[in-house]
């Protein structure tokens, strides 16, 4: 081409423009009421809905002439209603009375199959506090709790720990303010992510794996029950529930005299294919190295806050983004891969198996995961998960982004990183970050209060425009926040992680274990080694900042080599000391299990409050390994091993 | 709202038998314990018959076990009690009842009059 | 002969508070807290009035009330009203071989 032929280059002002000039003409109800209609509705993962919206999206990918559309199959087992109905009635003690409280029209997947008769124990939302702030003993016994503040899975958990035979799951009117008291939902027990019977391997056909269970599989069987049902066991126990748990007026804590809870689950297991869909606008420099932007699509029931908003804005953001490529001439340097997962609602199953079968190389070219799935919850808030290599990035957008109904800034607030909540189980982003160690961001637009229609068969285009009238405008915003972090991420020459992030977090972490320092000096140990690593991750940080400092940015070679450096830092901070098959969240931060500098300080704290539960031998291995993968971090930060200090 | 109503009532000889009948509507009916009570004329209640919600377990007075059954078919919302062998002290009301819980009656029919007598 | 014992018969003005008891055993009334009371006027079916004791199904009027001491339960109707005139039959669960469920003879309440 001649000089005069050549692309003008686009600045970030220009692209901003640009993409918010494209989204100001985007009808996103439509795309939302479209995902709702009959032919789409409901779509639990695997049935013919599901597949018809998979195909749909896939064509939709190739409208938008993405530079390559494809389709990913894996083979999962999910866990649906048998045809013989899950119940739950009272007996008398005697056994001679049964009275039917419900057979719910919900259900929770991954259940234990069994019939359990006890005593009925009030935990409150059912966490690890609620269930030690109880008086009556729940050992034995089955537990009611309320849905919110934790998820199922967690729960279950808790209620498991705490030797309970059962758990009800109901949605309280307080927190969730449904008229209609009959309403099912669902959930699903499995304290993981991905097919439960593949853990930390795909479930691609041909993969011969020898049978495999989850260690987050319950053992107990859990179901949830309408507001009404609630009632009625209400009913019949006694002892009115605490005022500061800010409940239903007719909340009662334990069963009365001479009566049981009888909870029966008969859930049958079945193997179902699913669909990842992906489309690519391939990056002009370094398209090796991509953002994946992905939306659940699958859902119990018509899951229009659930998965069709998710879905329209994946599909209005690879719309966009292919035409800001292919006719206004912007040329993202990295790849941008959109996803459709399928088996979400089963504990992001399609996303997590995705991970699973690209383990080895996944997080040497993904970079950012997006995940755009309940974005639209509401209006007042902005509220965001990530990993805090993105803080920065999404510090930045927070100032540039308007809120759609105030006009203000969503950057509000500067303290806003000390309120970001973890990543929890039920977010598609959480493998990506804590399994694979790939960065990643979650956000919504919501109240303080829960969008109560999730998971149920009101979630639907008629309740959601009820709820929030500006739908449309919200949903824009979300897609402004998504497409700036997109344009950011694949724009800039430097890579948009600010991995000096860790160094604050690191701090805090050692500032915690400080609190026990006697503890740890009785033990005959020293956190000098821990602080050691610390001041290398540091020194790491601070020569990969001098050197993008000094470095010509138009030298790409040495722009992807730094840049390939601030990629693994997620990744370094996953224990290569544990099993991604027994412990697949291995992320030291953000991960679950005892590799964890959480489970390190909950465990040492029990040296004080339980000493008989406190294990010396254990502690020193989590001590070791924490400073070890600490260290480790520190020095794939610092480059080549030539470089590294060894005096360690 | 909630209705039950009786029905097979009459004059019967002694010995001889009778089905009685209580078609249900307005609740889940599925969903309910129901009983059967009787009034003799002049007469306090006296419990009959429970059948539970599925089915599965029923039971009956002494003054009429082996000779009363209770059955249910809950496609149809209808209770029945089959009566054989009947006698003269077996002359009442019968009424069809739903127990939410508890033996607690809280819905009754408009009763059928069951007359024993040669 | 019943096995709950009921007074036959009860009467207050109206305006006043009559109490009506209901005798049985440590294997009913006294074993449980499933008694229940019903309302029956001449000529019509039962009305639950009481359930589980002292539980008050909506609709009925906040003048009933029950109780339970020992092998005993009580119906309370304060602030007597004509309408409150009928019989009044008390029931509960009993604990025997069989399964069981007891009535009272019946209470005739006047008001007068």
């Known amino acids: 081409k001649d000089d005069d032929d050549k692309v003008p280059q686009l600045y970030w002002d220009d692209l901003k423009k640009m993409l918010s000039e494209k989204l100001d003409t985007t009808d996103f109800t439509s795309t939302i009421k479209l995902l709702n209609e009959n032919s789409y509705v409901p779509r639990e993962a695997g049935s013919q809905k599901d597949e018809n919206l998979a195909w749909y999206i896939e064509n939709q990918f190739r409208e938008c002439k993405l530079s390559k559309v494809w389709r990913d199959e894996h083979f999962v087992k999910i866990q649906v209603k048998d045809s013989a109905q899950n119940s739950v009635t009272i007996t008398g003690t005697n056994s001679e009375f049964v009275y039917l409280v419900e057979n719910p029209g919900g259900y929770v997947a991954y259940s234990q199959n069994a019939t359990v008769t006890g005593k009925l124990v009030h935990a409150n939302f059912g966490t690890e506090k609620d269930f030690e702030d109880l008086d009556s003993p729940v050992n034995g016994s089955l537990v009611i709790v309320r849905a919110g503040k934790i998820t199922f899975a967690e729960k279950v958990a808790n209620a498991e720990s705490a030797n309970a035979i059962g758990v009800l799951i109901y949605m309280d009117k307080t927190k969730f303010p449904i008229v209609d008291a009959d309403v099912s939902f669902f959930g699903h027990a499995h304290l993981g992510t991905g097919d439960p019977y593949t853990p930390g391997f795909p479930s691609f056909n041909h993969t011969q794996f020898p049978p495999s269970r989850s260690s987050g599989l319950p053992n107990i069987p859990v179901q949830t029950i309408s507001r009404a049902a609630a009632e009625r066991l209400f009913e019949n126990m006694e002892g009115d529930c605490p005022s500061d748990w800010k409940t239903d007026s007719s909340c009662r804590m334990v069963t009365s005299q001479n009566k049981s809870v009888k909870l029966s689950v008969s859930n049958v297991m079945k193997e179902i294919k699913i669909l990842n869909i992906f489309g690519v606008i391939k990056g002009f420099v370094e398209p090796d190295r991509y953002v994946v932007v992905g939306a659940q699509r699958d859902s119990w029931g018509p899951g229009a806050a659930k998965s069709s908003v998710g879905t329209a804005l994946l599909l209005e953001l690879a719309q966009t983004f292919s035409d800001m490529v292919l006719k206004d001439g912007f040329q993202p340097s990295r790849s941008i891969v959109f996803a459709s997962w399928s088996a979400g609602d089963f504990g992001s199953v399609g996303a997590t198996e995705w991970l699973e079968g690209y383990l080895s190389s996944l997080h040497l070219k993904a970079f950012t995961f997006i995940n755009l799935d309940k974005a639209v919850l509401g209006t007042s808030n902005f509220r965001v998960s990530a990993s805090p290599l993105l803080y920065a990035l999404i510090e930045k957008t927070m100032q540039e982004v308007k809120h759609p109904v105030t006009g203000l800034s969503l950057y509000q607030d500067s303290n806003w990183a000390s309120k970001v909540e973890k990543l929890t189980f039920d977010n598609a982003a959480f493998p990506f970050l804590a399994y694979s160690g790939i960065p990643a961001v979650s956000f919504c637009f919501c109240e303080d209060t829960d969008y109560p229609y999730l998971g149920t068969t009101m979630d639907t285009y008629k309740e959601l425009i009820e709820k929030i009238p500006q739908l449309n405008k919200v949903a824009r915003a979300a897609a402004e926040v998504a497409g700036q972090f997109m344009i950011k991420l694949t724009h800039d020459v430097e890579l948009n992680l600010d991995y000096e992030r860790y160094n604050s977090q690191l701090l805090s972490f050692l500032r915690n274990l400080n609190q026990y320092r006697a503890d740890i000096r009785e033990m005959g140990l020293s956190l000098q080694w821990l602080y050691s690593a610390r001041g290398d991750f540091f020194r790491a940080t601070s020569r990969l900042t001098t050197d993008f400092k000094n470095s010509e940015k138009t030298d790409r070679f040495v722009m992807k080599e730094l840049n390939d450096r601030v990629m693994k830092v997620e990744y370094y901070f996953l224990s290569p000391y544990v099993s991604p098959r027994e412990s697949p969240f291995r992320h030291i931060f953000w991960g679950s299990g005892s590799h964890t500098l959480s489970a390190l300080l909950e465990h040492l704290k029990l040296r004080k409050t339980n000493n008989r539960a406190f294990n010396e031998t254990l502690f020193r291995n989590q001590l070791a390994l924490a400073t070890w993968t600490i260290q480790g971090a520190a020095n794939a930060l610092s480059g080549d091993i030539w470089d590294i200090d060894n005096e360690f | 709202q909630v209705q039950l109503v009786e029905s097979g009532g009459g004059v019967v000889q002694p010995g001889r038998s009778l089905r009685l009948s209580c078609a249900a509507s307005?609740?889940?009916?599925?969903?309910?314990?129901m009983h059967w009570v009787r009034q003799a004329p002049g007469k306090g209640l006296e419990w009959v018959a429970v059948?539970?919600?599925?089915?599965?377990?029923?039971y009956s007075a002494d003054s009429v076990k082996g000779r009363f059954t209770i059955s249910r078919d809950n496609s149809k919302n209808t209770l029945y009690l089959q009566m054989n062998s009947l006698r003269a002290e077996d002359t009442a009301v019968y009424y069809c009842?739903?127990?939410?819980?508890?033996?607690?009656?809280?819905?009754w029919g408009q009763g059928t009059l069951v007359t024993v007598s040669s | 002969q019943s096995a709950l014992t009921q007074p036959p018969s009860a009467s207050g003005s109206p305006g006043q508070s009559v109490t009506i008891s209901c005798s049985g055993t440590?294997?009913?009334?006294?074993?449980?807290?499933?008694v229940s009371w019903y309302q029956q006027h001449p000529g019509k079916a039962p009305k639950l009035m009481i359930s589980?004791?002292?539980k008050r199904p909506s609709g009925v009027p906040d003048r009933f009330s029950g109780s339970k001491s020992g092998n005993t339960a009580s119906l309370t109707v304060s602030g007597l009203q004509a309408e409150d005139e009928a019989d009044y039959y008390c029931?509960?669960?009993?604990?025997?071989?069989?399964?069981?469920?007891?009535f009272g003879g019946g209470t005739k309440l006047t008001v007068l």
């Open positions: 307005g609740f889940t009916f599925s969903s309910d314990a």
């Open positions: 589980e004791v002292s």
């Open positions: 009842a739903r127990d939410r819980q508890w033996l607690a009656f809280d819905y």
């Open positions: 059948i539970w919600y599925d089915g599965s377990n029923k």
């Open positions: 440590s294997s009913d009334v006294g074993g449980y807290n499933f």
């Open positions: 029931s509960s669960y009993r604990d025997s071989n069989n399964f069981d469920v007891l």
